[in-house]
């Protein structure tokens, strides 16, 4: 059969028809609709939005749309006992207090239920003590403090600037350093782009703006009380003392106006170098404690937030496949927001909504995809990827047998400069081919392809004439699908120019100022970047669900495996003497990579030549492609991180947002020179090389001829 016959496609029902149906004006309208009130996870407002989306997806034509609910641990400020930080004098009097809320943006002064800035899952407490400034609170920042500067954070309250790494890693590092509290703040060096006005006159962070966010270290566990299993009606819940990933010290976020008042009084050691200085008019002294006249003053935190088991709701829509209904391509993004969610997540949710509408239109005209497409509106992403993870835990047996791909759809934009894609190497060719067929929305690239503008603005560091595609890390809803279940995953959004804008994320991230107007006035007035992202995400889903042969190229995995092996080997070779002493060899890994490369090459040749009209052989070849990502899963998981099971990729142990390659080996080698038992440490390196080599070899063999 031809591809058209196989999926009941008439000539007009092709990718072009799907893409042509996507409209910028609709995305704009949906974004407006989704951002008029807050949709905090666990609230009535977010439940109502779930029901609205369910209803609209049904209207759009999906076969079924269901709500999947779970009862998970969430965290909220105490409405009558607000969180704040004080400077106290020697008598214990509060002489300065940080603000209790962000000044609301114009037009939103009368909106109720705006959650004040807080660090979700902070324990309660009122610690007081001297302040230590710890820069970004990265691993290397604490190394600098403790090892080079001999500054002890034990019993101190640390103040760290947001940026560079996930906030949960900052808190974990502070805890390990012995701190008794953490203050997080947004420094203008990271959240204020030069030459741009503050909101509402521009897209920069005003001094009273504050970034909310969770501070968990879940390592993929999902609901802290039910790791590994869904938080359903009959769930057994751990006690709070055994919950996964909760911080043990109070944490609170502030804006840069409040941070100025704390940092301007800092005494003690000068900053070690200019990389520790931000843009405030303060000395950026490390401390501990305040200078001269203020040396008797202390900082006191007042944190009264509570952790509560609360019901959350995912919306799951199904468009049944005509030929392979038991093969699932999933498009998912979250719905819950910290406040209005103008960018995060609703710029993504609006795009998903329009993609669903376009697919529904085609379905109403008699078309069906070859494979089943599942659409998901996840809840409680902001509280630790909870909705997606609980659903995947509940459906893990189906997903591991039937999951073809997962495409993530959080924020569509974090800038308006160029495309940004993070995905499995299996999707590289899909992304390249698709973007060559799409028009660039960029000024100066009229009539040119998206591939061309993307490659020009964000070139690959390794391959000339190709765009940069990054590794998947975490911090979003693809985590459970990729890192735990081994389902090929990808994400795409429009981003900023990283070379000229060195701030972290976008300035108004997770603040009250992330509004519809922010997007409509400053980021994408014509919604052309949103439309392009809809075309990329939707186009990927269309191809993954509809192409006869899955659009995965296993040879691209071979290329990156060699690159990652070279990289980890060069890290290890910084210790040549120890490698010799402990007989550390990477031969097995390089051999496995070589075998993978050869087998992948042969598989690709067979893929070109096989009889695509034979449904059994077609299914067999597609299954080998589908299960290749699965083959990189180690059922035992990574050391101390059982839910990170992918041997090739994991979120960095030092920054959840970043992906690390050969993470098991990388972590075994990290700071190995400081380990008290070098023999044991190098033994673990050898074990991790063994695990990696075995896994690559085993994955290669799944691509071999089956008999």
């Amino acid at each position: 059969k031809s591809s058209n016959e196989a999926t009941n496609i008439t000539p007009k029902h092709n990718m072009k028809a799907f893409l042509d149906e996507l409209k910028a004006e609709n995305i704009k309208k949906f974004l407006y609709n989704f951002t008029q009130i807050p949709h905090l996870a666990g609230t009535e407002q977010n439940f109502q939005l779930a029901k609205q989306i369910q209803s609209q997806w049904k209207e759009f034509g999906l076969d079924s749309v269901e709500l999947a609910h779970y009862d998970v641990l969430l965290s909220y400020p105490n409405k009558t006992h607000p969180n704040y930080i004080s400077i106290i004098n020697e008598d214990g009097n509060e002489i300065f207090n940080t603000s209790l809320f962000e000044p609301p943006p114009p037009g939103y002064e009368n909106v109720s239920d705006i959650v004040p800035p807080f660090s979700a899952f902070s324990p309660q407490g009122m610690p007081e003590g001297d302040l230590v400034y710890v820069n970004y609170a990265r691993t290397e920042d604490f190394f600098k403090l403790e090892r080079d500067m001999k500054i002890n954070c034990s019993g101190k309250i640390v103040i760290a600037r947001y940026g560079k790494v996930f906030r949960g890693n900052k808190v974990k590092n502070a805890q390990l350093a012995g701190a008794k509290g953490v203050i997080l703040y947004s420094d203008p060096a990271d959240y204020f782009a030069p030459g741009v006005k503050s909101y509402p006159d521009g897209w920069n962070l005003p001094g009273g703006g504050v970034q909310r966010g969770n501070i968990l270290n879940l390592n993929g566990a999902g609901d802290p009380l039910t790791p590994g299993y869904p938080a359903n009606e009959y769930a057994y819940r751990r006690g709070i003392a055994e919950a996964v990933g909760l911080p043990s010290i109070p944490v609170h976020p502030i804006g840069y106006y409040d941070a100025q008042k704390l940092l301007e009084k800092m005494g003690g050691s000068a900053p070690p170098d200019s990389s520790w200085r931000g843009s405030l008019k303060v000395p950026y002294n490390v401390g501990p404690g305040f200078t001269g006249n203020f040396s008797t003053q202390k900082v006191k935190m007042h944190i009264h937030s509570t952790n509560e088991v609360t019901r959350i709701y995912n919306v799951i829509g199904t468009l049944r496949g005509a030929v392979e209904p038991d093969r699932y391509v999933i498009l998912g993004g979250h719905r819950d927001s910290w406040v209005f969610g103008g960018i995060d997540p609703q710029s993504g949710a609006a795009v998903v909504h329009e993609i669903v509408r376009s697919f529904g239109t085609l379905k109403k005209e008699g078309w069906r995809p070859r494979r089943t497409i599942l659409f998901a509106s996840w809840d409680a992403e902001e509280f630790g990827l909870l909705g997606s993870t609980e659903w995947a835990e509940e459906n893990s047996r189906l997903l591991q047998e039937r999951g073809v791909a997962y495409i993530n759809a959080d924020s569509s934009i974090e800038g308006n400069y160029t495309l940004r894609v993070d995905c499995t190497p299996l999707m590289y060719s899909l992304v390249h081919n698709l973007t060559k067929e799409l028009k660039s929305p960029d000024e100066g690239f009229e009539g040119k392809s998206l591939y061309e503008s993307w490659t020009k603005k964000s070139p690959s560091p390794e391959f000339s004439g190709m765009p940069r595609i990054s590794k998947l890390g975490s911090g979003n809803d693809f985590e459970v699908f990729f890192q735990r279940l081994g389902i090929a995953s990808g994400r795409a959004r429009y981003t900023k120019n990283w070379e000229t804008n060195k701030f972290s994320g976008y300035p108004l991230y997770h603040s009250v100022y992330e509004t519809y107007e922010l997007v409509e006035k400053f980021y994408d007035p014509m919604f052309k970047y949103h439309l392009t992202v809809a075309q990329v995400r939707g186009g990927m889903v269309f191809e993954l669900a509809n192409s006869i042969v899955l659009p995965f190229d296993c040879r691209d995995y071979a290329v990156v495996l060699r690159k990652y092996a070279d990289k980890i080997y060069s890290i290890s070779m910084k210790h040549p003497q120890e490698m010799k002493t402990y007989s550390v060899s990477f031969d097995s890994l390089f051999s496995a990579v070589k075998n993978f490369t050869e087998i992948a090459s042969k598989f690709s040749e067979r893929l070109q030549d096989f009889d695509k009209s034979n449904p059994i052989v077609l299914r067999m070849m597609n299954d080998q492609l589908m299960f290749l990502e699965r083959a990189f899963i180690d059922p035992l998981g990574l050391p101390d991180r059982p839910f990170y099971r992918h041997v090739i990729y994991a979120p960095s142990s030092h920054n959840k947002y970043a992906g690390e390659s050969f993470p098991g080996i990388y972590d075994a080698l990290f700071d190995i020179e400081s380990k008290v038992d070098p023999s044991k440490a190098w033994g673990e390196v050898k074990r991790q090389i063994y695990v990696a080599a075995f896994t690559v070899q085993a994955a290669a063999e799944t691509l071999s001829e089956v008999a």
Epitope: I87, I95, F96, N97, S99, P103, P188, F192, G207, G208, Y256, Y257, Q260, K261, A270, S274, R277, G278, S279, L280, K281, V282, P283, Y284
Partner: antibody
């Protein structure tokens, strides 16, 4: 919009004290320091001191130390400058000015000025 | 205290012509954070001073682009590309890197 409104002109005798008020509106009062400056007739600007409404921390120019007192009333968003032991050379226009926070760190909004005349 | 020295004291200008004012500080105005807190104010006749330029070269909100600031360390310049009648008044440079101080002022008047 940001506004600083000062109290009216004063005529004082030498040795007396004067207290000038500066009422702020249009912004969060506690976020921005208030500076006090003066300008003698036909002369330039002279900084006298500044106060932080957030914690009442004060800084005085050495020249005015002991003679000037800066206070605030956060409930009414008002700053006060009291100058004691007045002499004829204190005749000047006295200004309050908001100390702009990041990114300015300059005096981005000024009161209309209060003329203080010291004369016997 | 830092001494700020402005020149010239008086600057007669022709409308449409450029103008330039110099300001020198008695020591470096570079803060430990790398920023230079040198600002320019204009005091129009009978009015309070108003901020024109902050941190050497940044125009404050609503300031026309004919005004520009430059300089580093201890030497700074304010330029008006084409003077207009409304630009008359006394221009002050000021630093806030240390305890705030002002220059003596430069009186700009129409010829």
């Amino acid at each position: 919009q940001v506004q600083l409104v000062q109290s009216g002109a004063e005529v004082k005798k030498p040795g007396a004290s004067v207290k000038v008020s500066c009422k702020a509106s249009g912004y969060t009062f506690t976020y921005f320091d208030i500076n006090w400056l003066r300008q003698a007739p036909g002369q330039g600007l002279e900084w006298m001191g500044g106060i932080s409404p957030g914690d009442s921390n004060v800084n005085y120019a050495q020249k005015f130390q002991g003679r000037v007192t800066l206070t605030i009333d956060t409930s009414t968003s008002t700053a006060y400058m009291e100058l004691s032991s007045l002499r004829s050379e204190d005749t000047a226009v006295y200004y309050c000015a908001r100390d702009g926070n990041f990114p300015y760190y300059a005096m981005d909004s000024w009161g209309q000025g209060t003329l203080v005349t010291v004369s016997s | 205290d830092i001494v700020m020295t402005q020149s010239p004291l008086s600057l007669p200008v022709t409308p449409g012509e450029p103008a330039s004012i110099s300001c020198r500080s008695s020591q470096s105005l570079v803060h430990s954070n790398g920023q230079t807190y040198l600002h320019w104010y204009l005091q129009k006749p009978g009015q309070s001073p108003q901020l024109l330029i902050y941190t050497v070269s940044n125009r404050f909100s609503g300031v026309p682009d004919r005004f520009s600031g430059s300089g580093s360390g201890t030497d700074f310049t304010l330029k008006i590309s084409r003077v207009e009648a409304e630009d008359v008044g006394v221009y002050y440079c000021s630093q806030s890197t240390h305890v705030p101080t002002f220059g003596g002022g430069t009186k700009v008047e129409i010829k």
